[in-house]
Interface confidence: low
């Protein structure tokens, strides 16, 4: 079926094109042969010029980008919102865990509080930073907490007779803490629980942030010139023939889109795997793999560990008295 | 004490926290997210079709444009397209993904590998070593009350404390701890933890 004769004056085409590119005189007054056209190859006279074709290509690619962004809007919002919500929730868990631990010290060991608050604060700060991706070693964090606590426990509770100026003994006490396993297996227990739960939490947040990155990447893809030409032919070449109201055929659109999005569609396999792997991770996030569970119970384990020290207090004081005697003498002088 | 509200009382490992229980827990929120994400599992494979359905396409019209001419919607020519002498659609597909897409695929592969290695195999939630060290050695339910790492006599049960994003009515930040909050009569050198 031959195309219907174009508008003898290209008037319709001009008024449409004006909306795309106001003020430009690129539309021929009357149909022209269009021998310079590269995309909308005419079968007869045409109302398009080379400049118009270029503008159509630009518009087509912009349209495509906007369609892609509107397609991903809901998914993008879902992940961005949840990433923010979980990050905030984890911060709240950390804050409450710190509060519970501080309250435990205040109510059970008031003599330790000023320093304990600081050590607990530093520990939970590191927990927060670890979740957000800092290069901090969980075992070091736990060791630092117990290394810092023991000198205070020793000087305030087990050997309160030491003068306040005795600070040199601290280094010796920190070393003794590990050598003598003064807290029993509690530090090891806490290390295992905290590292497992925090690792899972960290990877969960990393995965959500990568999800956002994936969508941002595909959202802002720059489509190739070839794709721009295909889109132009599909959406705009009909205008050159004065066919303003006609729409592309459905099957044709699918073929063009698959051509334009061949690269993007390659993500599909990995995207599916991403969602299923994330589901698997989430299903396992309970008990010692749930940071909420682990951190909110830390105060109790720390309490137990201090009780353990108290229980063995007599034996420890004697051993440490010998072990750290040199430090103490130096202080008393 | 001005620093700790009366409704938080910890003694002999009993934790009583008076606050409104919010039904939505973190784990339920995680599961809800996964369910919503699963509805987007075919997002990328469905994208070409989605875009066609959201851009002007002939649905009820008898005639449609196939890139070269006006044709009947159900004719052979409608599915074919006027590209024969232009450039090859197959070639366009063969070019492979853009570098940015390849990069993001690599990142996805990496995170998928990490997620798989981090996932807890069913029925293996507790490591043997942990069990031996006394973790969860008590009669604790799976969902409601979670036992929290403690050993010895006084096993503590904490009702899943943080109902999702439920800010408690108090805030016991270290910053608010005694010797750290500034009151009118407090000297600067009493603040011992301002940079902790």
């Amino acid at each position: 079926q031959p195309p219907p004769p174009p508008d003898a004056t290209c008037h319709q085409v001009r008024s449409f094109f004006q909306r795309l590119q106001p003020g430009l005189k690129w539309v021929p007054e009357t149909p022209v042969p269009g021998s310079d056209l590269q995309v909308c190859l005419p079968k007869g006279p045409t109302c398009c010029s080379r400049k118009m074709e270029e503008k159509y290509q630009l518009t087509a690619r912009l349209n495509m980008e906007q369609l892609l962004q509107s397609a991903s809007m809901e998914l993008k919002f879902l992940i961005i919102q949840n990433a923010a919500v979980f990050q905030e929730a984890f911060e709240i868990v950390v804050r409450h865990a710190k509060n519970y631990t501080n309250a435990m010290f205040k109510n059970n060991y008031p003599s330790l509080t000023p320093q304990a608050f600081e050590f607990v604060g530093e520990f939970f700060t590191d927990v927060s930073l670890y979740i957000l991706g800092s290069d901090i070693n969980v075992d070091d964090m736990v060791n630092e907490l117990f290394d810092s606590l023991f000198p205070v426990i020793y000087t305030q509770m087990m050997n309160p007779g030491l003068p306040e100026s005795v600070l040199d003994i601290n280094e010796c006490l920190r070393g003794a803490r590990r050598d003598l396993k003064v807290f029993g297996s509690f530090p090891k227990l806490i290390m295992t629980q905290v590292s497992k739960s925090l690792q899972v939490t960290r990877i969960f947040l990393q995965a959500l942030n990568l999800g956002i990155e994936v969508i941002n990447t595909t959202d802002h893809l720059k489509f190739s010139k070839d794709c721009g030409r295909m889109l132009t032919r599909m959406w705009y070449c009909s205008y050159c023939q004065g066919l303003m109201m006609v729409k592309p055929c459905g099957g044709y659109c699918n073929v063009v889109m698959q051509g334009c999005m061949a690269g993007v569609v390659e993500i599909d396999k990995y995207w599916r795997e991403y969602i299923l792997s994330l589901e698997e991770l989430v299903n396992g996030m309970y008990r010692i793999y749930d940071m909420e569970n682990v951190l909110l119970g830390l105060f109790s384990t720390i309490h137990d560990s201090i009780q353990y020290v108290q229980k063995n207090g007599g034996k420890l004081t004697t051993t440490i008295g010998k072990l750290c005697a040199h430090s103490q003498q130096r202080q008393y002088r | 004490s001005a620093y700790y509200p009366e409704d938080l009382f910890i003694d002999k490992k009993i934790l009583k926290v008076a606050h409104v229980e919010h039904e939505e827990t973190l784990s339920s929120r995680r599961r809800e997210l996964i369910q919503k994400l699963k509805s987007f599992i075919n997002f990328y494979s469905a994208l070409p079709g989605y875009i066609c359905s959201h851009s002007p396409v002939a649905e009820n019209d008898t005639l449609c444009w196939n890139g070269q001419e006006l044709v009947e919607r159900y004719s052979q020519k409608a599915a074919r397209n006027g590209m024969k002498n232009q450039f090859n659609l197959h070639e366009l597909k063969m070019k492979g993904p853009e570098p940015v897409v390849s990069q993001i695929i690599d990142k996805l592969k990496h995170i998928n590998q990490l997620l798989r290695t981090m996932s807890v195999p069913k029925g293996k939630v507790l490591d043997k070593s942990l069990d031996e060290e006394g973790l969860e050695s008590g009669d604790c339910g799976d969902d409601e009350d979670e036992c929290i790492g403690s050993s010895g006599d006084g096993m503590v049960k904490v009702k899943n404390q943080l109902r999702f994003l439920a800010e408690l009515a108090y805030d016991l930040d270290v910053d608010d701890a005694p010797g750290n909050k500034q009151h009118g009569n407090q000297k600067d050198n009493e603040i011992t933890t301002s940079h902790s």
């Epitope: 911060e91 804050r95 320093q115 600081e118 050590f119 530093e122 700060t125 590191d126 927060s128 930073l129 957000l132 800092s134 901090i136 290394d147 810092s148 000198p151 205070v152 600070l167 601290n170 280094e171 920190r174 | 805030d171 930040d173 910053d175 608010d176 750290n180 909050k181 600067d188 050198n189 603040i191 011992t192 301002s194 940079h195 902790s196």
Partner: antibody, heavy 120, light 112 residues
Framework: EVQLVESGGDLVKPGGSLKLSCAAS????????MSWVRQTPEKRLEWVAY????????YYPQTVKGRFTISRDNAKNTLYLQMSSLKSEDTAMYYC?????????????WGQGASVTVSS | DVVLTQSPLSQPVSLGDQASISCTSS???????????LHWYLQKPGQSPKLLIY???NRFSGVPDRFSGSGSGTDFTLKISRVEAEDLGVYFC?????????FGGGTKLEIK
């Protein structure tokens, strides 16, 4: 890349007010404590304000207490210093600095500074 | 407030030589948790200060190993084993064991 960019520095009369801003990028702003430090024309450094990551605990030295207010908007990744009742001795270059908490008070990143001149 | 006194005020040095800057505190900087919060910063001309060393002897990331910190209690030293042109500027010590945190008066490292 961690970046801190101060703005709002100006020439102001004694007794006047000024608000400095510090826009942070390249790190998780909401998890770090922050400080303002000033450098006098004689090149002496003086800490003027500190705020915890959540924003609920500001501290000041006696020299500025009651006149300066530090605040932060974690949603906007921005730190502020509201200065009022300014004196000529407040003339300085004002830097915002990130406290790397793991390093207790070591200020690991500083902005380029905002110049404040108090003069009649 | 804790007073930090740096010496010398100015340190003329030849490129490739070793330089040593001293920082003395009016009271001990050993914290009750066993850590000493004494830090060193370098301010190059026209720039803001940059962290070099934290907690007496720990080099901040990206700081060359020719910089080293030592000391305890009230006396601290920053050493630069082989001075390079890019090391010129003013060095400040700072403490955060006690509140408020304070800074030394600075030592200017310049070419002989």
């Amino acid at each position: 890349e961690v970046q801190l960019v101060e703005s709002g520095g100006d020439l102001v009369k004694p007794g006047g007010s000024l608000k400095l801003s510090c826009a942070a990028s390249g790190f998780a702003f909401g998890t770090y404590d922050m400080s303002w430090v000033r450098q006098t024309p004689e090149k002496r450094l003086e800490w003027v304000a500190y705020i915890s990551s959540g924003g609920n605990s500001p501290y000041y030295p006696q020299t500025v207490k009651g006149r300066f207010t530090i605040s932060r908007d974690n949603a906007k990744n921005t730190l502020y210093l509201q200065m009022s009742s300014l004196k000529s001795e407040d003339t300085a270059m004002y830097y915002c600095a990130r406290q790397n908490i793991a390093r207790r008070g070591a200020m690991d990143f500083w902005g380029q500074g905002a110049s404040v001149t108090v003069s009649s | 407030d804790v007073v930090l006194t740096q010496s010398p005020l100015s340190q003329p040095v030849s490129l490739g030589d070793q330089a040593s800057i001293s920082c003395t505190s009016s009271q001990s900087l050993l914290h009750s948790n066993g850590n000493t919060y004494l830090h060193w910063y370098l301010q190059k001309p026209g720039q803001s200060p940059k962290l070099l060393i934290y907690k007496v002897s720990n080099r901040f990331s990206g700081v060359p190993d020719r910089f080293s910190g030592s000391g305890s209690g009230t006396d601290f030293t920053l050493k630069i084993s082989r001075v390079e042109a890019e090391d010129l500027g003013v060095y400040f010590c700072s403490q955060s064991t006690h509140v408020p945190p304070t800074f030394g008066g600075g030592t200017k490292l310049e070419i002989k």
